[in-house]
């Protein structure tokens, strides 16, 4: 149990060509019961705890007090082999005929039962005195995960018998548990790369490689940290891990030098209004450093002189910005630039964009309201407001008239075409006050309303009116 013993990798049919452990019959062919194998191990399960006992348990029932002790035979203690080799080992036990109840032999590894993905065969050698049982276990192409302590269990007369362990130590090429990772670095600034590989066998020594040339003449013990004092151009780094079994090379990683971003491309106008433009763009290559923010530059395209450039800053994402506070019906040149930690990109190609026409900025002037009693209508006149080019083309007016009398309130509006500067509206209520306001309309929208003009509609023929479009509130002039 506690000492290491001879083991050679042999074929299953040669495994017991020499003397077998314990008593085995001559002239008896064994009969075998292969354990079922599955393609995959089951999910990991917690090994059950069992009370410690000796290999020769004391059976307590009176009927079996005279039974001889039963235990697994001594077997090899330690197997060392290379990864991808095949391995075979066994447990054997002699069960006298006096034992009536025996169960199959199960294989365990590090406290967990092995239920599949391995090949195990149990062979029985019966004779007059009892049966010798040999449980053969083989693993094809061992991997590191096969490392462990293996042992057999068997129930005899309801008592669990456990073999001594067989330590299986799998050695192989170094195995990386931490490989260098691609990083983006500032020019001429120091940075670190880490490489860690393990055996067995240990130790594992590390050589660093930069652009196919070794960096360190002497190997470093794993784990190794390489401090690179700085780079001026992109480089590829890898590490070599060496142990007694050979060499494993890590993936090669690109170390990129951070530069300013490339200019944005595909600057597009998604929407325009009279005073805003919604612009989108595709960011250029980030220069190996995340884009931090972008700048939208806007200048008036119509100006002959060097018009000042308006600059609007926004976050790098989303790649969208609404430029506001622009003039209506104006042409603009727009470009975008973005920056990372290194600096600003060049600006994108300039594109042309236009705002749409705006709404009028002033109300109609000189509003007068007359009551035409004979026709029972209000006659309203005004002066066309001074509309700028960017306010667009006048298409008409909106007249708002509100009628108030005791217990009655009526708010109405009319739209009239731009032809002429007068309109007539029917009287809605007598013995009331009518308040009139007028706004100009262009394709860009409706402008501001004029100051209210009040007129009192009498029950009969008495009329007050206000000729001014901008009276003090409540002011009226009599006709």
């Amino acid at each position: 149990g506690g000492t290491a013993e001879k083991w050679e990798e042999t074929e299953l049919d040669q495994l017991f060509s020499g003397p077998l452990p314990g008593r085995l019959p001559v002239n008896h062919r064994p009969f075998s019961a292969p354990h079922s194998s599955r393609d995959q191990l089951p999910p990991p399960q917690t090994g059950r705890s069992h009370p410690a006992h000796t290999a020769a348990p004391q059976v307590t029932s009176t009927a079996s007090k005279l039974l001889p002790p039963v235990a697994f035979n001594h077997t090899i203690g330690h197997i060392v082999l290379s990864e991808h080799k095949n391995v075979k080992f066994n447990c054997s036990i002699n069960i006298p005929n006096t034992y009536q109840e025996t169960a199959g032999i199960s294989w365990w590894k590090d406290g967990k039962e092995l239920l599949g993905a391995h090949h195990s065969i149990t062979q029985f050698y019966p004779d007059e005195e009892g049966v010798s049982i040999i449980a053969l276990f083989s693993i094809a192409s061992v991997q590191r995960s096969d490392n462990g302590s293996y042992f057999c269990k068997m129930k005899v007369n309801n008592r669990e018998i456990v073999s001594d362990p067989i330590y299986v130590e799998v050695q192989g090429l170094p195995y990386f548990i931490k490989q260098p990772e691609s990083v983006n670095v500032t020019r001429n600034t120091a940075f670190n790369l880490t490489c860690q590989a393990v055996g067995p066998p240990e130790p594992v020594n590390i050589f660093w490689v930069q652009n196919s040339s070794r960096v360190n003449e002497k190997p470093e013990r794993s784990p190794s940290v390489l401090t690179v004092p700085g780079l001026t151009e992109t480089a590829v780094f890898s590490c070599e891990a060496h142990n007694d079994k050979g060499l494993t090379v890590s993936k090669g990683v690109h170390i990129n030098i951070k530069v300013i971003p490339s200019p944005p491309t595909e600057v597009h106008i998604l929407n325009s209004t009279a005073h805003s433009i919604l612009v989108s763009w595709v960011p250029g290559f980030d220069g190996y450093s995340p884009l931090q923010n972008c700048s939208i530059q806007v200048k008036e395209a119509d100006r002959l002189s060097n018009g000042s450039v308006m600059v609007f800053n926004t976050s790098a994402s989303p790649h969208l910005y609404e430029i506001q506070q622009l003039q209506a019906l104006a042409n603009y040149s727009i470009a975008v630039s973005c920056r990372n930690e290194i600096g600003w990109s060049a600006v994108s190609p300039w594109i042309l964009a236009s705002t749409t026409e705006g709404a009028p900025s002033v109300a109609p002037l000189n509003i007068t309201v007359f009551l035409n009693e004979s026709n029972n209508i209000l006659d309203i006149r005004w002066t066309k407001p001074p509309i700028k080019r960017q306010d667009g083309e006048l298409v008409g007016y909106r007249i708002s008239h509100v009628w108030e009398s005791a217990g009655t309130y009526k708010e109405l509006s009319e739209e009239v075409s731009q032809n002429g500067s007068w309109a007539q509206i029917p009287v809605q209520i007598h013995n009331a006050t009518c308040t009139v306001r007028i706004a100009a309309i262009t394709k860009g929208g409706i402008g501001p309303f004029s100051e209210p003009v009040n007129i009192i509609i009498p029950e009969h023929s008495k009329v007050d009116y206000a000729p001014s479009s901008t009276p003090a509130p409540g002011n009226t002039d009599s006709m």
Partner: antibody, heavy 118, light 112 residues
Framework: QDQLQQSGPELVKPGASVKISCKAS????????IHWVKQRPGQGLEWVGW????????KYNERFKGKATLTADTSSSTAYMQLSSLTSEDSAVYYC???????????WGQGTSVTVSS | DAVMTQTPLSLPVSLGDQASISCRSS???????????LHWYLQKPGQSPQLLIY???NRFSGVLDRFSGSGSGTDFTLKISRVEAEDLGVYFC?????????FGSGTKLEIK
Amino acid sequence: QDQLQQSGPELVKPGASVKISCKASGYSFTSYYIHWVKQRPGQGLEWVGWIFPGNGNTKYNERFKGKATLTADTSSSTAYMQLSSLTSEDSAVYYCARLGLIYALDYWGQGTSVTVSS
Amino acid sequence: DAVMTQTPLSLPVSLGDQASISCRSSQSLENSNGNTYLHWYLQKPGQSPQLLIYRVSNRFSGVLDRFSGSGSGTDFTLKISRVEAEDLGVYFCLQVTHVPFTFGSGTKLEIK
């Protein structure tokens, strides 16, 4: 992290017995041998014996047969060594250690000091 | 029993020097499986022994490459290429090829 935690120091009278413990954690206790090692003050190391907790099998150094008894309780992942008929020669630090896959004593307990004095 | 004779008992060294410790067995430690179960341990003052080298020449996980082991059969050597202050303590060899397992008497590495 594989670990072995031993019980605290013991002061016992000659002729008495003492039972010291070694609690394992971080690995399958029933799968690896536990060895016991004696170290007298200012002296070398002496192998006492081993136990395989999975089945209770033991092996002793002839010099410690009748002196040391090794047991294990798998439910608590604890190995024990009982020393009987103590004399001043048994005053020492006793270590438990795991026989790892590499077939070396790879992890050791911190040691238990046993002082035999009247 | 396999008797392990370790020399020297005491080894005074200067920091940065190389140290060499020998361990000789009264019988061959090579097992029939071709492995030699000779291990080296360091015991620092007030601490448990810690594994340095297993099976003659394999460094245990975390052991620095200043430590190396060599030998075969009955004669084995532990070398420390550049002694540092943290290396001070008592070094033992241990054989686990034969029962009973046996330790060397120990070599105390100390500063000159």
